[in-house]
Interface confidence: low
């Protein structure tokens, strides 16, 4: 189920799958929600620790049991991922942080009159992930009203420093507020060049596009279909970026499909989940559980309810069925995508709907914070 | 909203505009999306106009002037006015609207979380009121959704300011001693939301007040936490699953 409570003065011990810097616990929670394996997180505000390297530290954690031991740590904030929390699942983060400088690669500097204008510039720049703004009262006169647009390899700051008269925040592209607009077109038999930022396996180009949309550095992608000439590259989804923000070249190529991230769309973003079921397809991955259920839809529901389940395969092989029920293989992987995709099998596969934001789950659970 | 500022897209995705289409079409009240098929608003919005088919509910919008005849809207399946609401009083000013068709959630149209039943222990320090209502007492409906940050006022303090009315435990008040910021005509039914532990909750429903933004005259809101049993009872579907964002 969905758990939204935060535990103050508590830190989860162990289970680390990733760490990064975030300005507050809510942003850390959002990163946990979108991380394929993160179930729990712990955040260390600046006031909670003297170690400068761990200030603003956000620690993403996994656990086979869904929980980890809590240790007392003054000032720390811990909580759960919002996977399975329906409409609260959003990559949109509007807050502006006063007195904080989020560090990254500064790729653009301009003078603006307000922090809101700086955020708007970041939102309207295809490469900008976050920004810092020096206010009118910044101690160095030449930097006053400077708006620094930034990015980093992971989409989060490379460091966060406490600094008076500086305000920082994130791009509002995930809020569907970009003025850039987006290319909805899918280009058949076309491969894009440029830098690959990640490689995953997907059953079709639409899943590839959604993954690209929610990847911090993916601006466009190329997908190699299941009939691509090189077997080892079939169903490969290459997430790409470039300095200019658009592909520098494209090559006509049979059985490839290319397209763009939809992060810069105005008013609508795709849901961060994949609801389609793929008949005759087997998704390979680490086995989480095997259960007998009646029908592929029930298998998908079972996967969705089991928070660690990322995808599933429902087998229709006679040896995998008892009366009306057949085996439902609940699976996971390091990156949330199948480790292999096989065709021509007797069964169907699909993804967990835990990140779909249309669920009527009890997403507003509240419990008093532990002191 | 008096003393407010323009909202931005998706900032208050639960805010809806309740409009009436008679000879002309006008915004009448605000409301809050609390589930795919449920809107919470003030009962007094329907005084004299409880005809379901004259109402149009616009969700996922920021600017009323963007509404054209082609703008999609929801229609009402059922209006549920609190059984103890009296037209002549401010008590139990709460109503539920069941929409004819469920809405999909997007960044611009998604529900607000409801408080826990009888929530009295939470101290809310970051509360906002939103709406398209008047920006001054003798004003007019605003085009762009307005927002204003207003502190909650204790019921004891509120009662001192409204000697002629009974401020009950089922009401919550908000306002500045000096006035200047408040809800106003046309904001009725809309949300008073407070952010606590990173989560927005629907604390109040804009109900009434003496004038707008007057000194020492806070706005009075229906206290949602006090009506959680009623909301859950009315929104419970036939399969026994609550159809809105309720606390566990």
């Amino acid at each position: 189920g969905c758990l939204t409570q935060l535990y103050e003065n508590a830190f989860f011990r162990g289970g680390d799958v990733a760490s990064m810097y975030t300005p507050n616990a809510q942003y850390c929670q959002m990163r946990c929600t979108f991380h394929p394996r993160c179930l729990l997180f712990s955040f260390l505000p600046a006031s909670s620790i003297n170690d400068m390297e761990k200030r603003f530290g956000c620690f993403l954690k996994d656990s086979v049991t869904g929980t980890l031991p809590k240790v007392h740590r003054t000032g720390a904030v811990s909580g759960h991922s919002l996977k399975q929390c329906g409409h609260q699942i959003s990559a949109c983060h509007r807050d502006i942080y006063k007195g904080v400088d989020m560090r990254g690669v500064n790729f653009n500097v301009s003078k603006v009159s307000s922090v809101e204008e700086c955020q708007k510039r970041c939102t309207s720049n295809i490469r900008c992930q976050f920004f810092s703004y020096a206010t009118q009262t910044f101690h160095k006169a030449e930097y006053r009203n400077n708006c620094l647009l930034k990015y980093s390899p992971g989409g989060t700051p490379t460091a966060i420093k406490v600094l008076s008269n500086v305000e920082s925040g994130f791009s509002l592209k995930p809020c569907a507020l970009s003025e850039i607009g987006c290319h909805m077109n899918i280009f058949q038999h076309l491969a894009f060049s440029d830098v690959d930022v990640a490689r995953v396996l997907t059953p079709d180009a639409f899943v590839c596009r959604t993954i690209c949309t929610y990847h911090p550095n993916c601006l466009f992608f190329t997908f190699y279909t299941n009939v691509w000439k090189i077997e080892s590259q079939r169903n490969v989804c290459l997430l790409k970026t470039s300095e200019s923000g658009t592909p520098s070249s494209s090559t006509p190529q049979e059985n490839t499909i290319s397209g763009y991230s939809l992060l810069t769309c105005k008013r609508t973003l795709p849901e961060p989940c994949h609801s389609k079921i793929y008949p005759g397809v087997d998704f390979g991955g680490e086995e989480l559980n095997v259960t007998f259920v009646k029908g592929v839809n029930v298998c998908q529901e079972t996967c969705t309810k089991m928070i660690r389940c990322q995808f599933f395969t429902y087998s229709l092989l006679p040896e995998d069925c008892k009366e009306e029920k057949c085996k439902c293989f609940l699976r996971l992987s390091m990156d949330g995508s199948p480790t292999r995709i096989a065709y021509g099998t007797q069964g169907s596969s699909g993804y967990s709907l835990r990140l779909c934001n249309t669920g009527d789950n009890s997403v507003c659970t509240t419990k008093t914070s532990t002191r | 909203i008096v003393g407010g500022t323009n909202s931005s897209w998706g900032e208050w995705p639960w805010q809806v505009s309740l409009q009436v289409k008679l000879t002309a079409q006008r915004h009448l009240c605000g409301g809050s999306l609390i589930g795919h098929q449920w809107v919470l608003t003030a009962a007094h919005c329907f005084d004299g106009l409880p005809l379901q088919d004259v109402w149009r509910i616009y969700s996922g919008i920021l600017n009323l002037s963007d509404i054209t005849k082609d703008t999609p809207f929801s229609q009402i399946k059922e209006i549920i006015i609190h059984q103890n609401y009296k037209v002549s009083e401010g008590n139990h000013d709460i109503a539920l609207i069941k929409l004819q068709a469920p809405l999909n959630y997007t960044e611009f149209q998604k529900p607000i979380c409801l408080p826990s039943k009888g929530d009295t222990s939470t101290i809310y320090t970051n509360c906002w009121v939103t709406g398209w209502g008047f920006s001054k007492e003798k004003g007019e409906i605003q085009n762009i959704l307005q927002k204003v940050n207003i502190p909650l006022v204790t019921n004891e303090e509120c009662q001192k300011r409204y000697q002629d009315y009974k401020i009950t435990q089922r009401m919550v008040c908000a306002g500045y001693k000096e006035g200047g910021k408040d809800a106003c005509k046309g904001d009725s039914g809309g949300p008073l939301v407070c952010k606590h532990n990173g989560m927005w909750r629907l604390v109040g429903i804009t109900s009434w007040g003496e004038g707008c933004a007057r000194r020492e005259q806070p706005g009075v809101y229906t206290k949602v936490a006090e009506y959680m049993d009623w909301i859950l009872e009315k929104t419970q579907s036939s399969d026994g699953k609550a159809q809105m964002q309720s606390p566990a």
């Epitope: - | 008679l22 006008r26 007094h44 004299g48 109900s207």
Partner: antibody, heavy 122, light 106 residues
Framework: EVQLLESGGGLVQPGGSLRLSCAAS????????MMWVRQAPGKGLEWVSG????????VYADSVKGRFTISRDNSKNTLYLQMNSLRAEDTAVYYC???????????????WGQGTMVTVSS | DIQMTQSPSTLSASVGDRVTITCRAS??????LAWYQQKPGKAPNLLIY???TLESGVPSRFSGSGSGTEFTLTISSLQPDDFATYYC????????FGQGTKVEIK
Amino acid sequence: EVQLLESGGGLVQPGGSLRLSCAASGFTFSHYIMMWVRQAPGKGLEWVSGIYSSGGITVYADSVKGRFTISRDNSKNTLYLQMNSLRAEDTAVYYCAYRRIGVPRRDAFDIWGQGTMVTVSS
Amino acid sequence: DIQMTQSPSTLSASVGDRVTITCRASQSISSWLAWYQQKPGKAPNLLIYKASTLESGVPSRFSGSGSGTEFTLTISSLQPDDFATYYCQQYNTYWTFGQGTKVEIK
């Protein structure tokens, strides 16, 4: 003291026009829905028209729709009823009315003017 | 449109009598009903709203009941000042009055 004072009535020929006014005092006029109600000689009460506090919404009885127009000027605390294409059956005492309560609502009417007589006759 | 039908049209009674006037709505109006008293040459006076709530300053001998489509106004003990015409009014959807009931001296 709360008061409503109607004016503008008189004798008019069928097809003619009249504009009634209702001057309000003693309350915050702009907060309230205002009504016109009429009463033909020796007959019952008939609701004619209503206008929402901002003036944005107007509602009419079927018998007057398209002929009568209700309006208000909140800065002058005045309610109006523009009556066009008058018929003999429009002959009546015209009252303006509203509901005086702490919380502005639409409701029964507890404050009425004294009425103004409109006679439509050739 | 909602029609309101009052009965009787005329009622003859004496001081001290218990008087009952009924009002029927053509469709359910919940409890959105008011009762008025009107004397010749005067504006109507609100007695009861929300079917049964006595307006401030109205004597307690007046009472109202009913919901949905059937409503009743009762004067428990008729006083000389009560001889007048009584109207019901629905305000569920717009506003409609009944045709009136004249209470006259027997």
